[in-house]
């Protein structure tokens, strides 16, 4: 985007440093933590966002520990390694040389090991189930209105192609949004379901990554939709490899 004296910012990612030093004085934005250039006309990858979040000053960071019931993402936040495209590297290691394999949304999918651990490929998360519970309302939301509002949200705010929102289920007060996107379905330029789900999660928690208007304003026929609990489940194209010890 073009730089102006007071308008060189990244509308899709607050966690950037922007300056008018691109070609022709264009505004160029780089993600905090990694210093990688980001495309401010679309969502930034979850890997770069996590890296930026971990690089932010501690007093400016809100650590959110996932619920114990979220069977997959229970390792909390970490400082990930991202590849040159901003995707998670298949193998992640911490400062103490403990390593593990992750899927395309950065969630651990193997037991932890040492530096000899091999992660042959980045396994794609092709199915995401977002489980929400909304605050009490006078009555249940109309299912078709709720469905339309949430589909509209993912299409407009996260630029996710409608075909990737597989279903919206509702049994008051539980809402479930199913996102599905196989490797073969994802074309160049398509937003990744993992990135969309992460932006949605941050929006729901009141930690919007967008500049400008700020927070989410979800309404169904004018009635505010306020979420009081969020759980996100991830299914990979290849099942995870955990030892039986962990399963017990």
């Amino acid at each position: 985007h073009t730089a102006a004296q007071d308008n060189c910012t990244c509308p899709t990612n607050k966690m950037t440093v922007c300056s008018p030093d691109g070609p022709g004085g264009r505004c160029q934005c780089r993600a905090l933590g990694s210093g990688m250039a980001v495309d401010c006309s679309t969502l930034t990858s979850k890997c770069l966002l996590l890296k930026a979040r971990m690089s932010a000053p501690k007093n400016a960071r809100t650590l959110v520990r996932p619920s114990e019931h979220a069977l997959v993402d229970n390792d909390g936040l970490y400082d990930p390694d991202c590849d040159p495209e901003g995707r998670f590297k298949a193998r992640q290691c911490n400062q103490t040389s403990v390593c593990w394999c992750v899927n395309s949304v950065g969630v651990r999918r193997t037991d932890k090991g040492d530096l000899s651990l091999r992660c042959d490929e980045l396994v794609r998360t092709h199915h995401i189930l977002i489980d929400l519970r909304h605050r009490p309302t006078a009555g249940a939301f109309n299912h078709s209105d709720l469905d339309a509002e949430l589909r509209r949200l993912f299409r407009e705010r996260y630029r996710l192609h409608p075909k990737f929102v597989a279903a919206v289920h509702y049994e008051q007060p539980t809402i479930q949004i199913e996102l599905r996107q196989n490797t073969s379905q994802k074309a160049a330029g398509d937003v990744d379901i993992g990135d969309a789900a992460y932006y949605f999660e941050r929006d729901i928690k009141g930690e919007s990554l967008f500049q400008g208007r700020g927070g989410l304003d979800l309404r169904v026929r004018g009635e505010p939709l306020q979420v009081e609990r969020t759980l996100i489940y991830y299914l990979d194209e290849i099942p995870p490899k955990f030892s039986m010890k962990r399963l017990t």
Partner: antibody, heavy 126, light 103 residues
């Protein structure tokens, strides 16, 4: 069919105030952001301001900030522009417009306008 | 708000293809037709490439980087008008307008 009807224009005195109303029909008003855009005689289009669908958010162009208030009544499918401390440069045709992307991160923008009213002319002169 | 740059005028013969460009932002472009000063604008393209249902299919929109393009394929005499681009910055902006003359 989507219809947007503006009213309230006319001759206004400098320093005075005007109140324009946009009446919408043919669509679910509650589901859309709404804009005011104006055009001075012989000039281009100028974005005046926007209000989101619930009325909880407004944003204004620097030229009218501090003088303008946009409000809406979803029950009546109407939007209002109140502009105080009128100046000669406020002269022009004022259009009500509909925004097609209420959730977009840049939803304040002109790029999402998909429908326009016929306009109401405002002349600020002593 | 950022300045949007578009040519002041373009001309074409009936049946030819016309392209009008607008540059200045990577946001979403809209294109608005105004047939005479003071007449209401009509949206021919919004959100880069979406066309209102009552607009002929000869109007199309595209974007590349920070440039938006309005294409009129098989221009007609009735398309003669001023075309304004609008874009998606924190407060929406419009270009100065391009006058299309059909020869």
């Amino acid at each position: 069919a989507v219809t947007l009807d503006e009213s309230g224009g006319g001759l206004q005195t400098p320093g005075g105030a005007l109140s324009l109303v946009c009446k919408a029909s043919g669509f679910d008003f509650i589901d859309y952001d709404m804009f005011w855009v104006r055009q001075a005689p012989g000039k281009g289009l100028e974005w005046v301001g926007v209000i989101n669908r619930s009325g909880s958010y407004t944003n204004y162009a620097p030229a009218v900030k501090g003088r303008a208030t946009i409000s809406r009544d979803n029950g009546q499918s109407t939007m209002r522009l109140q502009l105080n401390n009128l100046r000669a440069e406020d002269t022009g045709t004022y259009y009500c417009a509909r925004g097609a992307c209420t959730h977009c991160w840049d939803a304040d923008s002109a790029g999402y306008i998909d429908a326009w009213g016929h306009g109401t002319e405002v002349i600020v002169s002593s | 708000a950022l300045a949007l740059t578009q040519p002041s005028s373009v001309s074409a013969n009936p049946g030819e293809t016309v392209k009008i460009t607008c540059s200045g932002s990577s946001g979403s472009y809209g294109w608005f037709q105004q047939k005479s000063p003071g007449s209401a604008p009509v949206t021919v393209i919004y959100w880069n490439d979406k066309r209102p249902s009552d607009i002929p299919s000869r109007f199309s929109g595209s974007t590349s980087g920070s440039t938006g393009t309005l294409t009129i394929t098989g221009v007609q005499a009735d398309d003669e008008a001023v075309y304004f681009c609008g874009n998606a910055d924190s407060s929406g902006t419009f270009g100065a307008g391009t006058t299309l003359t059909v020869l």
